[in-house]
């Protein structure tokens, strides 16, 4: 046999840092949040930059704040830190020179934040337990280069893990709606998905990209729909599922982020709508998840005649293209709308609500503003 | 206020068939599955089926399956039950009722019908 | 089927007594068990759904606990009103099924 040289390892280790800023640490302390996104961008791009700036810079993968945590002097950060090094490498010598990188560059970081250089640790961890701290985050996905699709309609299959919130409606062990993992025990659909059918006994919800066999299945405690969505309209078209156990997170099942209230998603972002729902209008759902691509529309140019005409309220957002190429369609209906932030983190944009037909020219598809219904959302579930 | 009237007393014949009617008010009736539920003469309650008024899509305890048929029609908003080849253990009163809400825990039957009596005699 | 076990038919109390009544399911009903009234001219009323939670307009002197396969009514402070047959039933499974009725009497 013979040595492959060019062969490389990869390093996960559980990092922290101390800084100090003058924001409150309530202000970012909950995962999530605006702030604390913001504050770990900041810390991420620190310590990308401190790499950036040594001779590892080919060796840095990524860095991902975790959580931070309150001290008596200022705030602790938890980081995953990911490196790879030629498999040549003494392990020992690499810890050795990851955490100098760390403790000699970072000391040239522009704040704020004022991060202390000193207070580094780094700690190896292996692959299981790197995926068990992303799985605990929400928003995380196993990404895979994601090609422009056409519609769920005609759209593109996905892998495992690559929606890892999406969960599957059943009724008496029938597809009938989408629905998003919010945290292990609650799952967030459209009311319009419980007009008919209401006994939570009946309905269970599987996780994973096939819908037999799934991944994980759980039943449904109770079902809660929001107290002013009056069926046939459309308005308030959110409901809560509470799971009848919690699920444990893994690569394949866990979270999606909430975005804050105060979050404005803007028109002509991209965004991701997944489902099991019919490749054609008044068609059939499909066992395997489906993905496709749909930026948002504003709601001036949603609410035009040839559009829905004064029908999309402030609870609503629309989403697709005018030209009717890509879209969501029945069976699709409760699922996620999602959109990834600049570390990589998606989040929770809209629940798929309702459309005329599926990927008409001039109507897209229309999904619940998740952001004008978060204090809902709070209100129920305390997340 | 819900309200489901059912109808009047039924005496029939063995081998002839039976509809009860029951007059939901008060709501939205397609909004809600309506059960019927049996229960002979100083005996225990037994459900036969329900009907979600809204698709038409019924579901039936496999005992009564071929004896009661459940229908509904939404422009008068009643729900039926037709009983068919009556034999003298299809004497009993028959019960309607609606589900209740879903804006927390689910109630099951939160409202009944004041039931029809049938009897069957040769 | 999920049977329903009422094991007493009927029981006799004096007005004022704290009464309960038991009933079993043949598997775990996962809480999903009610508790229903019929008075003697036969109307049927829900008393408590979801093992515990108390239907609207029902006196608090109702109360119903269990998990799993063991459940219970309780009525506090008997009043005369409450002269009725009860029963359970889980909506957990089809076919819904009751229990056999506990027919309760005053002393």
């Known amino acids: 046999h013979y040595v492959r040289y060019n062969q490389k390892k990869t390093y996960n280790y559980y990092s922290t840092l101390s800084f100090t800023t003058d924001k409150l640490y309530a202000e970012f302390g909950r995962e999530a949040s605006n702030n604390f996104t913001e504050m770990s961008q900041r810390l991420e791009s620190m310590v990308k930059n401190a790499f950036y700036k040594s001779p590892l810079r080919e060796e840095f993968v990524k860095s991902q704040v975790i959580k931070f945590s309150q001290q008596k002097h200022g705030v602790l950060a938890h980081m995953l830190l990911i490196c790879r090094f030629h498999s040549t490498e003494d392990p020992e010598t690499v810890d050795k020179i990851v955490q100098l990188v760390l403790h000699e560059k970072l000391q040239d970081a522009v704040g704020p934040p004022k991060v202390d250089p000193h207070s580094v640790k780094i700690k190896k961890i292996n692959k299981t337990e790197t995926d068990s701290y992303l799985n605990h985050c929400c928003g995380t996905r196993r990404s895979k280069t994601l090609g422009q699709s056409l519609r769920i309609v005609g759209g593109t299959e996905v892998e495992e893990g690559e929606w890892p919130w999406q969960a599957s409606l059943q009724w008496d062990g029938s597809h009938r709606c989408g629905a998003t993992l919010i945290n292990a025990t609650w799952l967030v659909s459209a009311a319009h998905c419980f007009t008919t059918y209401k006994n939570p006994a009946r309905w269970t919800a599987s996780f994973g990209v096939t819908i037999k066999p799934s991944k994980m299945k759980r039943g449904l405690r109770r079902i809660i729909v929001h107290e002013k969505y009056k069926h046939p309209s459309h308005d308030y078209d959110i409901s809560l599922a509470e799971l009848s156990s919690p699920v444990p997170y893994t690569n394949a099942v866990h979270r999606v982020c909430l975005p804050d209230a105060s979050y404005e998603f803007q028109p002509g972002d991209v965004m991701f709508v997944t489902g099991f729902g019919a490749l054609k209008n008044d068609g059939y759902s499909q066992n395997h998840l489906r993905q496709a691509q749909v930026t948002l529309i504003d709601a001036t140019t949603c609410n035009e005649p040839q559009a829905y005409n004064d029908a999309i309220t402030p609870r609503m957002l629309c989403a697709g293209s005018l030209e009717g190429k890509t879209d969501a369609c029945q069976g699709d209906s409760g699922g996620p709308l999602v959109s990834s932030d600049a570390r990589d983190i998606w989040y929770l944009a809209g629940i798929v609500s309702w459309g005329d037909e599926c990927a008409k020219p001039n109507k897209p598809g229309v999904y619940t503003r998740v952001t004008a219904l978060r204090d809902w959302i709070t209100s129920k579930t305390g997340i | 206020q819900v309200q489901l009237q059912q109808s009047g007393a039924e005496l029939e014949r063995p081998g002839a068939s039976v509809k009860l009617s029951c007059k939901a008010s008060?709501?939205?009736?397609?909004?809600?599955?309506i059960s019927w539920v049996k229960q002979r003469i100083g005996q225990g309650l037994e459900w036969i089926g329900e009907?979600?008024?809204?698709?038409?899509?019924?579901y039936y305890n496999e005992k009564f399956k071929g004896k009661a048929t459940l229908t509904a029609d939404k422009s008068s908003s009643t729900a039926y039950m037709q009983l068919s080849s009556l034999t003298s253990e299809d004497s009993a009163v028959y019960f309607c009722?609606?589900?209740?809400?879903?804006?927390?825990?689910?109630?099951?039957?939160?409202?009944w019908g004041q039931g029809t009596l049938v009897a069957v005699s040769a | 089927d999920i049977q329903m076990t009422q094991t007493t038919s009927s029981l006799s109390a004096s007005l004022g007594d704290r009464v309960t009544i038991s009933c079993r399911a043949s598997?775990?009903?996962?809480?999903?068990l009610n508790w229903y009234q019929q008075k003697p001219d036969g109307t049927v009323k829900l008393l408590i759904y979801?093992?515990?939670r108390l239907h609207s307009g029902v006196p608090s002197r109702f109360s119903g606990s269990g998990s799993g396969t063991d459940y219970s009514l309780t009525i506090s402070n008997l009043e005369p009103e409450d002269i009725a047959t009860y029963y359970c039933?889980?909506?957990?499974?089809?076919?819904?099924?009751f229990g056999s009725g506990t027919k309760l009497e005053i002393k």
């Open positions: 009722a609606r589900e209740g809400d879903y804006y927390g825990d689910y109630e099951g039957f939160a409202y």
């Open positions: 008060g709501y939205t009736f397609t909004s809600y599955a």
């Open positions: 009907i979600y008024p809204r698709n038409n899509d019924t």
């Open positions: 598997q775990d009903v996962r809480n999903f």
């Open positions: 979801y093992t515990s």
């Open positions: 039933q889980q909506y957990s499974n089809l076919p819904y099924t």
